[in-house]
Amino acid sequence: EPPTACREKQYLINSQCCSLCQPGQKLVSDCTEFTETECLPCSESEFLDTWNRETRCHQHKYCDPNLGLQVQQKGTSETDTICTCEEGLHCTSESCESCVPHRSCLPGFGVKQIATGVSDTICEPCPVGFFSNVSSAFEKCRPWTSCETKDLVVQQAGTNKTDVVCGPQDRQR
């Protein structure tokens, strides 16, 4: 009796089960009662990453430098090329089809996580006792200066954007 379902890594065609082509190979001809499935390796610029019955291999992704992209990992016959962004840029999506500049954290905010080729800068508000007076993609919130350790007193309180101002102690005390 002809099969109605096939084993793993097989497919049903013309009432018989044929072997799928292994990753890195494309289908040339289906199996018959006399021959196995005929498969051919993908060319150098192509890939197939699953057991398949595709008659064409997929083209490797092109990392377009005009879009700020560069090759992170070269593709093989079984894997696609992985693109990443050039220094100072990060991907706009998970598939990394284009890049945008990293954002800077504004004064009052510090860098919680520095950007990578695939993720943007993560900023956080400077908590009490910390400040940032610059717009930066790298600098964290810095602690206010400790006037006491310098035998000085606070003359002007700090904010999330400014450091404290220290001054000499009042001698009339």
């Epitope: 009662e33 006399f34 021959t35 196995e36």
Partner: antibody
Amino acid sequence: EVKLVESGGGLVKPGASLKLSCAASGFTFSNYGISWVRQTSDKRLEWVASISSGGDNTYYPDNVKGRFTISRENAKNTLYLQMSSLKSEDTALYYCARAGEKAMDYWGQGTSVTVSS
Amino acid sequence: DIVLTQSPVTLSVTPGDSVSLSCRASQTINNNLHWYQQKSHESPRLLIKYASQSISGIPSRFSGSGSGTDFTLSINSVETEDFGIYFCQQFSSWPLTFGAGTKLELK
């Protein structure tokens, strides 16, 4: 018991035609593809033709394509090979063989074809 | 067409010897290869399928190995009934092709 019995061989002149038969028994004939394979005097084996279980697909090597025709009558459990425009190089012992899991798992005893003037 | 080259052409052995017969394909055929034995005045019979799978009724002294382009048929302790010609056959693509055979004869 699986049995394949070839017949129809003989001595013919170049350019002549000949029809070989293969009678099958001991298995469900209509479930199996069948091939013809020939063996020359130097003992080399050469695939000649194949036909699918239903008879809808046939396969030939280039050197016999257009001259040989494989066919089958499932109701009669019989396989045929119609050979025309025979050449001296077609001289051989012709076997029919059953295709089981893509292997020629059972062979007949062969029938001899001689093409000579 | 895929060409199968068998070696040696002839192998002269004494019963009890263990032997290896080679079959080399002109291009990769994965494990899509069968082995047949043909004794004198008999039809070929299937010995090993898919390069290494045993066949019911065939003595366990026969074994096959290999994948890609290089294949081996091994006979562990040859018996007198093993003399004859051994053929490999590929079923990776059309046309189906056979090797020219290795003749196993008595030394």
